[in-house]
């Protein structure tokens, strides 16, 4: 369960890949598209509002008999729109929604090497936001074998 309904903190940051490509958002035909692209030097990076929530993970689910806490995030590039996991399509989409947000909008935050982070689907453990063919997609990762998967590493910069 997510502790309380308010985030413990929020920050505005631009999101880029391990290879320094920018994640950008464009309004097309009344819906938002998500792109992964090299930005021209003078172009301003899109900002995303990251809301951080603390989630209690009961020992019955944790597998090691100990209650634990996880840090979950929601990502909103523009008012009332949130990134959501579409597990059926293995895609990442922007949807307009009202609070309380659906579980598909929550991602478990992982600290990774090189001060990067990864976003794991709350609704589908082992599945992460990643980059595929210059788009964001959901990528299944064997956590023990695929630690360095660069396509699921992201940088946050304020």
């Amino acid at each position: 369960s997510i502790t309380g309904i308010s985030p413990i903190t929020e920050s505005l940051a631009s999101l880029s890949t391990y290879n320094d490509q920018s994640i950008t958002f464009a309004l097309e035909d009344e819906s938002y598209e998500i792109y992964v692209e090299d930005l021209k030097k003078d172009k301003k990076k899109d900002k995303v509002l990251l809301s951080y929530y603390e989630s209690q993970h009961p020992s019955s689910e944790s597998g090691d008999g100990v209650d634990g806490k996880m840090l979950m995030v929601t990502l909103s590039p523009t008012k009332d729109f949130w990134l959501q996991a579409n597990n059926k399509e293995h895609s990442v989409e922007l949807h307009k929604c009202e609070k309380p947000l659906p579980d598909q909008a929550f991602f478990v935050l992982h600290n990774r090497s090189f001060n990067c982070v990864s976003f794991e689907c709350k609704t589908d453990p082992g599945v992460f936001i990643g980059v595929k063919d210059n788009h964001l997609a959901l990528i299944k990762v064997d956590y023990s074998e695929n630690l360095g998967s660069e396509n699921i590493l992201f940088k946050l910069s304020e």
């Epitope: 903190t9 090691d64 634990g68 806490k69 840090l71 992982h110």
Partner: antibody, heavy 121, light 106 residues
């Protein structure tokens, strides 16, 4: 319950290497990062490095060339190895666990009791 | 690396008073700051995380505030066990640096 316990050699000769083992219980190394911190007697705290849940490592920039951190998940052990010790490496060495699964943002709730390492001829 | 400047290095106070310690980060760290206290010969204890969140079991007379680069830590109604050392630590990016510490004296 969650426990971390360091075991070290106590005394190390200058220019030799240091190996400390952190035995952990009550949690899984595949879910939590373990960090090493040291404290020179009467001084402040120095963060040395981390072995993250995913297996990647991070190190103190000034000590990176002399440090390595590894683990044996089957034995629930994390290891700190430090080469070419000097007298100013004399300190209490702590292993600590992340507050959050997979993330260091929440600081460190659980600390070992520390092991004193003296570097002296 | 992010430098953490903690002040004062030492402070005198009396039982029942309030004290404030500050920590400045050399670059923005969002809210990713923790405060610890350490009794002599003991391991540090987490008091505050995410700049303002009280760790489990920590009395409400401890509080934290700030974000970005400037942070404060306050103890109200000082008790005898509070006259020890305190440290801030940034957890925004590795290496996770500590402030130099503050010794609270009676």
């Amino acid at each position: 319950q969650v426990q971390l316990k360091e075991s070290g050699p106590g005394l190390v000769a200058p220019s030799h290497s240091l190996s400390i083992t952190c035995n952990v219980s009550g949690f899984s190394l595949s879910k939590y990062g373990v960090h090493w911190i040291r404290q020179i007697p009467g001084r402040g705290l120095d963060w040395l490095g981390v072995l993250r849940a995913g297996g990647s490592t991070g190190y103190n920039s000034a000590l990176m060339s002399r440090l390595s951190i590894s683990k044996d998940s089957s034995k629930s052990q994390v290891f700190l190895k430090m080469n070419d010790l000097r007298t100013d490496d004399t300190a209490v060495y702590f292993c600590v666990r992340d507050h959050y699964y997979y993330s260091s943002y929440g600081g460190f709730v659980y600390w070992g009791q520390g092991t004193l390492v003296t570097v002296s001829a | 690396d992010i430098q953490m400047t903690q002040s004062p290095a030492s402070q005198s106070a009396s039982l029942g008073e309030s004290v404030t310690i500050t920590c400045l980060a050399s670059q923005t760290i969002g809210a990713w700051l923790a405060w610890y206290r350490q009794q002599p010969g003991k391991s540090p204890q987490l008091l505050i995380y995410a700049a303002t969140r009280l760790a489990d079991g920590v009395p409400s007379r401890f509080s934290g505030s700030g974000s970005g680069t400037e942070f404060s830590f306050k103890i109200n109604n000082l008790q005898a066990e509070d006259f020890v050392s305190y440290y801030c630590q940034q957890l925004d990016s590795s290496p996770y640096t500590f402030g130099g510490g503050t010794r609270l004296e009676m």
